[in-house]
């Protein structure tokens, strides 16, 4: 009955040697796909000469191959009842699911502009940067390949810094040959409501980015929870994207290839403002661009990027305050399309398919010595691009899992 | 308070160097950059270059490349300025100075100077 | 680079009257101009800074005004301990330039 049903699962989803869990956990059976919406400024010299609201138009989607590399450094340790791993990073382009190519060109925000003018407010260095920006002739916005924009293109103004600095920039840079973590996570051995849940990240229990409780990280990777989810559940994961834990709650009961499956998604609650969601208080860190911590919708997580203004939202900045993109012109929000999701089989508590949205922004202010920011008026968080990360169990592997697990229990 | 104390007044040969100081007190020294000026006498000022006193990050006038290096001690809080291959136009009055960042305030604390004096 | 000219190069007053210097920029620097007054064997001492922003500790008889390429520093009535050279210096652009001086005197 349900009893042996129960012991087979608490079994099967242990993160050790053997088990369907972890020859699916090491090395994802599922196609994961990352696409890209660029968004292409429309009026350069208007924003830069006026400061008028910024006419974006967004093109995409560019698709990546992403995920596809086996963990590294897998190590259990079976003193703790943990696993540590290392998970690589590679991203193969597929045209054939893109629009385009990445020889695409885009109008986008100068980011090295935008950040060195940010991280260095000492208006003599200003000076020295104006120098270098004129010198090098970079501008508020500048025209870059899809894979300089992604993936790095050495910049020219940061080129001429007779200093070592990294002199090439990228919204994603680096990125191949790199692995994220080292994550340490609890293989459920000797308690299975811990499996997949993070003991460690880089060593540590705690991020540093940001106080109190934000700085705490929760849950699992997303990837797979504890077996026996409730629709009752806050499901609770890190992101190492976003610099930040976060949670999803039940939306609804969904029928995945004839899985039931269970639809949970990123509430709009959390990305509220504390005065909304008290909770959120640390997670706002200046008082200037959060209007005293009213506006919402947008994360600074500059200090989790080496000080550069990186804001990151939902897609279109849905759920985000007006005044936030109110200087924007050409964004369209939709739940349906901009939210996230994960579609949890709720026995194994594997997630069967996901849609992970964010978009990544860049604040960029006036500034009186920088030549090319001179005549802004007001800040800008200014959106780059959007992303729609997605991944959906096999059919092959969908029938297996009917037969193996879902058949089973009905 | 804050105090820029500059070394004493110095006689050089042409074509030889010098190298002076400024020892910063009554304040944390890599907080800020120091600034020299030069004013040859009874003439106007001219602005050298600054260093960053944090990372030793050097800016200079166009008209001092080559001729004024400037470089600091951390450990003793003291800025040193050193001039090459000196000619009468280097006979001046040179001063380290320091500024209030942030504010938009240039030169705002400046040293007593240190006269060099270029004579055979 | 920005030129600054300066004028006029010298004047004399008699105590208690007014005193205008002048200073044009040959690129708009906006209001990023500051006043400096050097007394015989001391250094500058900063007057006045960016934004027309008198120091703290300096009298109110000293001013400034001007935008763009056309600034004047201003002394109203002027007295003995004022005698001194003026600088102008412009902290817009790369290399920052001073004026050539002004060189007050009392008649």
């Known amino acids: 009955g349900d009893l042996l049903i129960q012991k087979t699962i608490k079994k099967q989803v242990v993160l050790e040697e053997g088990t369907i869990a972890f020859k699916n956990w090491v090395k994802t059976g599922t196609e994961v796909y990352r696409q890209f919406w660029i968004f292409d400024v429309q009026n350069p010299q208007e924003v830069m000469m006026n400061s008028s609201n910024i006419q974006v138009k967004q093109r995409g989607p560019y698709t990546y191959r992403v995920r596809f590399l086996a963990k590294e450094n897998v190590t259990q340790d079976a003193e703790d009842n943990t696993v540590s791993f290392l998970q690589p990073n590679g991203a193969i382009f597929e045209p054939s699911l893109s629009v385009g190519t990445e020889a695409d060109n885009f109008t986008v925000l100068n980011l090295a502009v935008a950040a060195a003018s940010h991280i260095y407010q000492n208006q003599f260095v200003q000076m020295i940067l104006n120098s270098l920006i004129n010198k090098s002739k970079s501008s508020m916005f500048q025209v870059r390949t899809l894979r300089e924009l992604l993936w790095g293109y050495r910049d020219p103004f940061l080129s001429l810094v007779p200093y070592p600095v990294t002199t090439t920039v990228g919204l994603f840079y680096p990125y191949n040959n790199t692995a994220d973590g080292v994550y340490k996570v609890f293989n459920g051995k000797d308690n299975i409501s811990k499996v997949a849940i993070i003991d460690t990240y880089k060593g540590k229990r705690n991020l540093s980015y940001w106080e109190s409780h934000c700085d705490m990280i929760n849950g699992t990777d997303a990837a797979s929870f504890p077996p026996f989810v409730e629709k009752s559940q806050v499901l609770q994961f890190f992101s190492s994207d976003i610099c930040r834990s976060i949670y999803a709650v039940f939306e609804s009961d969904v029928n995945l290839k004839g899985i039931p499956v269970y639809r949970f998604v990123l509430p709009s609650k959390a990305f509220a403002s504390p005065v909304e969601n008290p909770d959120n208080y640390c997670f706002c860190t200046e008082k200037i661009i959060s209007k005293n911590c009213t506006s919402y919708g947008v994360l600074d997580i500059s200090k989790c990027k080496e000080g550069r203004p990186v804001y990151i939202s939902l897609p279109h900045f849905l759920y985000a305050s007006p005044d936030v993109s109110e200087p924007i012109d050409g964004l369209n929000p939709n739940e349906e399309e901009h939210r996230t999701y994960l579609d949890i089989e709720p026995i194994t508590g594997f997630t069967l398919q996901f849609a992970k949205r964010l978009q990544v922004n860049l604040l960029v202010k006036p500034s009186e010595k920088i030549q090319v920011l001179k005549n802004l008026k007001r800040n800008y968080i200014v959106p780059i691009l959007w992303l729609n990360e997605t991944g959906t169990i096999g059919d092959e592997k969908a029938n297996m899992f009917r037969s193996q697990v879902t058949g089973k229990i009905n | 308070q804050v105090q820029l104390q500059q070394s004493g007044a110095e006689l050089v040969m042409p074509g030889a160097s010098v190298k002076m100081s400024c020892k910063a007190s009554g304040y944390t020294f890599t907080d800020y950059w120091m600034h020299w000026v030069k004013q040859r006498p009874g003439q106007g000022l001219e602005w050298i270059g600054s260093i960053d006193t944090s990372d030793s990050y050097t800016t200079y006038s166009q008209k001092f490349k080559g001729k004024a290096t400037l470089t600091v001690d951390e450990s003793s809080s003291t800025a040193y300025m050193e001039l090459a291959r000196l000619t009468s136009e280097d006979s001046a009055i040179y001063y380290c100075?320091?500024?209030?960042?942030?504010?938009?305030?240039?030169?705002?604390?400046w040293g007593q100077g240190t006269l060099v004096t270029v004579s055979a | 680079e920005t030129t600054v000219t300066q004028s006029p190069a010298s004047l004399s007053v008699a105590t208690g009257e007014k005193v205008t210097i002048r200073c044009i920029t040959s690129t708009d620097i906006d209001d990023d101009m500051n006043w400096y007054q050097q007394k015989p064997g001391e250094p500058p001492k900063l007057l006045i800074s960016e934004g027309n922003t008198l120091r703290p500790g300096v009298p109110s008889r000293f001013s400034s005004s001007g935008y763009g390429t056309d600034f004047v520093f201003t002394i109203e009535n002027t007295l003995s301990e004022d005698v001194a050279d003026y600088y102008c210096l412009q902290s817009d652009n790369m290399p920052l330039t001073f004026g050539a001086g002004t060189k007050l005197e009392l008649k």
């Open positions: 100075v320091r500024g209030e960042d942030y504010e938009g305030t240039w030169f705002a604390y």
